[in-house]
């Protein structure tokens, strides 16, 4: 168990002309609040899918009126950190976003109104217990500074939080066949001992026999990886060698939903239903009201006064969930063959095809990279009947073996501005473009000419694409 | 007490490679960026790069991009930086620096004692 | 990468006078600057963090100022054991990068 902390440190324009204008007046002054969505693994997931690793809601920051003729500084900012508390293992990869609203606190009619500024997202790595890692993205001509880490509860230490720490009980040395707990010299590991043959990679024990599979991975010593491709039914078929779930514990078992949440099966996963009060992927969040701003994508809120009566989300078309968090999901059908990602761009589906496949919805089978390496943990890319490397930062050339400045390929278009990062190269796009490399046109209308955006993001909205 | 303790002076013929550690003592060694900086004599401060000592992760300054790598041993809180190919004007004193808790980039708030590397045939 | 630029590259003073340096950067880092005193043969000792924030254990007579892309270190009654080479840092990019250094000498 451990906590996911977040640190916003600026949000404003960024660098380079054509500066975004104040997002508040003198006649609608505004304040500022985050919200992060956690999800584990490194999947391109769509920005409406469950905040499987936790969700959390800044406070408002404090009310800002822009001054007449005034480029926008940045923008004041909430105090304190976003902490998103985990139960389990802290997965060790992630994919985050960061949306940035603006609460409008003019005379409206039935309170403030709130509109999405900006999101951001993005797939990391990052070990538990280590220092802050720092990062800057760019969404439109907003720029989104922020920091983030994984910290232990303890007795949990590691890269992962799951070992277990205990302070010595003599002062001199830990018990037979126990270890310093490395980083706290003063205390020794605790004698958990798991289910004999747990993978040691992939499983972990909170209690002495257990064996707890991290994501992606089952069977009763964690060592088959999952697929859900080819299972039956859902839990997946008992045979453990195709790689489906084993029947066996369900994802309702303990029961994941706090605060006395009823939790019911999904065929995907779970779903808690909350009481009064609290809501949450696992009803973790406590005392919200509509004050609290809980319904999201222009959702209106109703009810709720105070934080023992429930209050409801009146979501827009487009959106359900008890707080408007999902998008209504037209992927459902799974039209992507091949393990492609759906994308709903609202005017249409998209498929994006996994490495060696091809097509409006990845049926036509490439196979460019059999046979071909990449050095220095670059991955074949594969696609027009040739090979090509992902070479990892610091690397270049056509089989990853040359040393290499990330920006020295001039990677951002349209006269973007590289910069090198530890997290990979960022790019500070010239006015009138966005993206990554800063790849896309930004038209005059505000729409995007996005071959391929994330659902849940609608043409115009502010957002950087990894 | 946080201390940074640096190995001892070296002296190498140029096209060698010198590897300098620096052992850190009295805090979480994992939860803190180590630095690398170095000063040619009579010179000003060089800043070589960064480690993170949780996951081995670095970050080095665009000129000695292919010539430095950085490691850690965390079984014994000790980082290590390697400069290869060495030149006579990689002879400096070369600094280990840990640099302070903020959750931005931060500055360093405790060095070790320097290392001089000489280099000459 | 941002540029520092310090100045004066050196200066003369005698005990007891207000000194003080300037350090500009190439490009807006805020408050994220840090100043260092080296004396010959001793590694760097950080005195100012974050602009203007003092480093625990260092006397007052030192002083920080400035955001954005002009920075001073005051010291304000310089004492003997203040003749020193001073160094600012910025810190605002993952690429941290030092000014030349100012050299203090006595009068």
């Known amino acids: 168990a451990g906590v996911f902390e977040l640190q916003i440190h600026s949000f404003g324009p960024g660098p380079g002309p054509g500066a975004p204008r104040s997002p508040c007046s003198a006649r609608l002054p505004c304040r500022l609040f985050f919200r992060v969505c956690l999800k584990p693994g490194l999947s391109e997931e769509a920005a409406e899918s469950p905040c499987a690793l936790g969700a959390a809601l800044s406070a408002r920051g404090p009310v800002y009126t822009e001054q007449p003729g005034a480029p926008a500084p940045d923008l004041p900012l909430p105090d304190g950190l976003l902490q998103v508390p985990f139960r389990d293992a802290w997965p060790g990869t992630f994919s985050f976003i960061i949306e940035t609203w603006r609460e409008e606190l003019g005379d409206q009619i039935g309170g403030p109104a709130w509109s999405l500024l900006a999101r951001v997202a993005g797939r990391r790595r990052l070990a538990a217990g280590g220092p802050w890692a720092r990062d800057i993205q760019r969404a439109g001509a907003w720029e989104l500074r922020f920091s983030y880490r994984a910290r232990c509860e303890p007795p949990a230490v590691g890269t992962a939080c799951t070992r277990l720490c205990r302070p010595r009980s003599a002062p001199s040395r830990c018990g037979p066949g126990l270890r310093p707990c490395a980083p706290l010299e003063d205390e020794c590991e605790a004698p958990l001992v798991c289910r004999a043959g747990c993978s040691p990679e992939h499983g972990f024990c909170e209690q002495p026999g257990e064996c707890r599979c991290l994501e992606g991975w089952t069977g009763p010593l964690c060592t088959v990886p999952v697929s859900t491709s080819s299972c039956l039914s859902p839990r997946g078929p008992s045979s453990a060698t195709t790689g489906c779930l084993v029947p066996g514990p369900g994802p309702c078992d303990g029961n994941p939903c706090a605060n006395g949440g009823s939790c019911s099966e999904t065929p995907r996963s779970f779903e808690c239903t909350c009481p009064r009060g609290f809501y949450g992927l696992r009803c973790e969040v406590s005392g919200v009201t509509c004050a609290d701003g809980p319904c999201f994508n222009g959702g209106l809120c109703v009810g709720g006064a105070d934080p023992d009566s429930a209050y409801i989300c009146h979501c827009p078309p487009g959106f359900q969930g008890s707080n408007c968090e999902k998008r209504v999901d037209r992927c459902s059908l799974q039209p992507c063959r091949n393990g492609g990602l759906c994308l709903d761009l609202g005017h249409a589906l998209r498929c994006r095809c996994r490495a060696g496949f091809a097509g409006p919805r990845c049926e036509h089978d490439l196979d460019d990279c059999a046979g071909r390496a990449c050095a220095n943990g670059g991955t074949c890319v594969e696609g027009g009947g040739a090979h090509r490397c992902s070479c990892a930062l610091g690397f270049g050339g056509r089989d990853c073996r040359e040393r290499a400045d990330p920006c020295a390929a001039r990677p951002c278009a349209h006269g973007g501005r590289c910069y090198a990062h530890f997290s990979g190269l960022v790019c500070a796009c010239a006015p009138g473009y966005m993206g990554a490399r800063c790849e896309f046109p930004v038209h005059p209308d505000g729409a995007s000419a996005l071959p391929a955006a994330p659902p849940g993001l609608r043409p115009g909205d502010p957002q950087r694409y990894l | 007490q946080v201390q940074l303790v640096q190995s001892g002076a070296e002296v190498k013929k140029p096209g060698a490679s010198v590897k300098v550690s620096c052992k850190a003592s009295g805090y979480t060694f994992t939860g803190y960026y180590m630095h690398w900086v170095r000063q040619a004599p009579g010179q000003g401060l060089e800043w070589m790069g960064w480690i993170n000592p949780n996951s081995g992760d670095t970050s080095y300054a665009q000129r000695f991009l292919g010539r430095v790598t950085m490691t850690r041993d965390t079984s014994i809180n000790t980082v290590h930086m390697e400069l290869s190919r060495l030149g006579s004007d990689d002879t400096a004193v070369y600094y280990c620096?840990?640099?302070?808790?903020?959750?931005?980039?931060?500055?360093?708030?405790?060095w070790g004692q320097g290392t001089l590397v000489t280099v000459s045939s | 990468d941002i540029q520092m630029t310090q100045s004066p590259s050196s200066l003369s003073a005698s005990v007891g006078d207000r000194v003080t340096i300037t350090c500009r950067a190439s490009?807006?880092?805020?408050?994220?600057l840090g100043w260092y005193q080296q004396k010959p043969g001793k590694a760097p000792k950080r005195l100012i963090y974050a602009a203007s924030s003092l480093q625990s254990g260092v006397p007052s007579k030192f002083s920080g100022s400035g955001s954005g892309t002009e920075f001073t270190l005051t010291i304000s009654s310089l004492q003997p054991e203040d003749f020193a080479t001073y160094y600012c840092?910025?810190?605002?990019?993952?690429?941290?990068?030092f000014g030349q250094g100012t050299k203090v000498e006595i009068k």
């Open positions: 620096a840990r640099e302070d808790d903020s959750s931005w980039y931060g500055s360093f708030d405790y």
């Open positions: 490009q807006g880092i805020r408050n994220y």
């Open positions: 840092l910025q810190h605002d990019s993952d690429l941290r990068t």
